[in-house]
């Protein structure tokens, strides 16, 4: 449609109580400059007067020459293609529609953006990979849809309530396609960093905390396995019997299949966490190690050298 | 056309008040800054103040703070200047003049004067 | 509160003269919002002030090209490039951006 004034800003902005909302926007009139605007809280249109009613947070008229410093309001637009806002600080009864009446010599227009302001600091997401896999890099990412001039804010990493050593690239939107700041960590987890808990947490400049989102970790890995064998110096004579146990201490995903290797041959028939040898004879002697296999891969324990002597 | 017209000026002892008033025409009253600008004989000007309509927001300069209110009625399209304990020194002719932009901001229309004289 | 000091206090000229009028500001009268709200009114005797000039260089509408404004800061000029008949009056700066508004104490521009 033609006779339609062009707007480009975000649907929605969202802030917390106390903060600020910076509101990118631009237009484009129907004819020549802009005469006036007025921006409303929750406007409606009155009927009888052909006016819209609501509170006016902003008047160009009005506020246009009053020193910004003394304005909660700020329209930092122009006439004929800024429409940018700033409202600072923001409170919670400013959550609903903005409406910005526009009006030049012969047109009108009421163009409506939400704000959603929140009583607390809202956490942020936290976005993972769909899958982690031990020792391959990964970017954590941490976003918040919220980012305003007049009150930075930072995003921190921990693991398990420590700040991660790795450093973090953070990065803020304030255009009219999107506002947010995210924060990007590249992390190599390691198999033991399965279940462990990773948190992004919003602070102020000041580093005083403000919210937070957790995630645990789902470390894709090879079965993890600890050897241990009866007697415990693995030294025996001929006739003697052993005994080598394989204990799984951690597979993600759970482990399918178990077996025995010696000198790096499998076992014929040893699927089982315990390996019996009865009688051995000397030349049973060798390097012995349990394999265990999920999803991911096959995991080996240590050796173990298994030295049968003569009786 | 955009108009405003003085009026209320006249001889006042001093110690006295005196209500002035600037009738607006032509344009939206309630949506336009209106100052007022004074003038004592062979002198300079000198802003008073200023008024918003649409909400009664006021500015003063310091020195008429306490002395002068500005007011003003939408229903009627008028802007007020209250004076009050006046001196020798506030004779004068006063001005009204409208703050004519949303953008640019500058006095464009002026009133053409009312002369007050505080003498006894 | 902000003086607005302009030189000469008077000056006589002749017709088709190049005449400069200084304003000179006691603090940056840049207004917060980044702009100078700085204007130049003329006024002849028993009439009005008239608007000439605004925000330091933008000449207001049906003001005549020979009337043009500069500067930037706390100095600022008002030429008149070849005075005309017309053009002899008194002429005021003004600083819009900080309370109290202040004029300069003016300028009279007479025949020579």
């Known amino acids: 449609d033609s006779s339609k004034w062009v707007f480009e800003h975000p649907e929605t902005l969202y802030a917390w109580e106390g903060a600020c909302v910076w509101i990118p926007c631009t237009y484009r009139a129907l004819d020549g400059d802009l005469e006036s605007f007025i921006l409303f809280h929750n406007p409606e249109y009155n009927k009888n007067t052909s006016k819209f009613d609501g509170t006016r947070l902003y008047e160009s008229t009005k506020d246009g020459k009053v020193p910004s410093e003394q304005k909660r309001v700020q329209f930092l637009g122009d006439k004929n293609k800024n429409c940018t806002l700033s409202i600072h600080p923001v409170h919670l009864n400013d959550s609903g529609q903005l409406g910005l009446r526009m009006e030049s010599k012969t047109e009108k227009w009421m163009e409506r953006i939400h704000l959603n302001v929140s009583e607390r600091p809202f956490p942020p997401h936290i976005q993972l990979p769909p899958e982690i896999q031990e020792s391959q890099e990964v970017t954590l990412t941490c976003l918040l849809n919220f980012s305003c001039y007049g009150y930075p804010i930072q995003l921190q990493w921990l693991l398990e309530g420590v700040p991660m050593r790795q450093a973090a690239v953070t990065s803020t939107s304030l255009t009219i396609k999107s506002v947010f700041t995210r924060s990007e960590l590249k992390f190599s987890p390691q198999w033991s960093h399965h279940g462990k808990i990773v948190t992004c947490q919003l602070q102020d400049a000041d580093g005083k905390f403000l919210s937070n989102d957790t995630v645990q970790l789902n470390v894709k890995h090879t079965p993890k396995l600890e050897i241990k064998v009866t007697p415990s110096d693995a030294i025996v004579r001929e006739g003697d019997s052993v005994t080598m146990t394989c204990e799984v201490s951690s597979s993600n995903p759970e482990y399918t299949t178990v077996s025995w290797l010696k000198d790096g041959t499998s076992l014929k028939k040893q699927n089982t966490f315990t390996l019996n040898l009865r009688e051995v004879t000397k030349d049973q002697s060798g390097k012995y190690c349990c394999q265990v296999s999920n999803d991911v891969g096959p995991g080996r324990s240590e050796e173990v050298f298994l030295q049968v002597q003569y009786a | 056309e955009v108009q405003l017209v003085e009026s209320g000026g006249g001889l006042v002892q001093p110690g006295g008040s005196l209500r002035l008033s600037c009738a607006a025409s032509?344009?939206?009253?309630?949506?336009?800054?209106m100052n007022w600008v004074r003038q004592a004989p062979g002198k300079g000007l000198e802003w008073v103040g200023r008024?918003?309509?649409?909400?009664?927001?006021?500015n003063y300069s310091g020195k008429f703070k306490g002395r002068f209110t500005i007011s003003a009625d939408t229903s009627k399209n008028t802007a007020y200047l209250q004076m009050n304990s006046l001196r020798a020194e506030d004779t004068a002719v006063y001005y009204c003049?409208?703050?004519?932009?949303?953008?640019?901001?500058?006095?464009?229309?002026w009133g053409q004067g009312t002369l007050v004289t505080v003498s006894s | 509160d902000i003086q607005m000091t302009q030189s000469p206090s008077s000056l006589s000229a002749s017709v088709g003269d190049r005449v400069t009028i200084t304003c000179r500001s006691s603090?940056?009268?840049?207004?917060?919002?980044?702009?100078?709200?700085l204007e130049w009114y003329q006024q002849k005797p028993g009439k009005a002030p008239k608007l000439l000039i605004y925000?330091?260089?933008n000449r207001f509408s049906g003001v005549p090209s020979r009337f043009s404004g500069s500067g930037s800061g706390t100095d600022f000029t008002l030429t008149i490039s070849s005075l005309q008949p017309e053009d002899f009056a008194t002429y005021y700066c003004?600083?819009?951006?900080?309370?109290?508004?202040?004029f300069g104490q003016g300028t009279k521009v007479e025949i020579k």
């Open positions: 003049a409208r703050d004519g932009s949303s953008w640019d901001w500058y006095f464009d229309v």
């Open positions: 008024i918003y309509p649409g909400d009664g927001d006021t």
């Open positions: 925000k330091v260089s």
């Open positions: 032509g344009y939206e009253f309630s949506r336009s800054w």
């Open positions: 603090q940056s009268i840049v207004h917060s919002a980044g702009n100078t709200f």
């Open positions: 003004f600083q819009g951006s900080q309370f109290p508004y202040t």
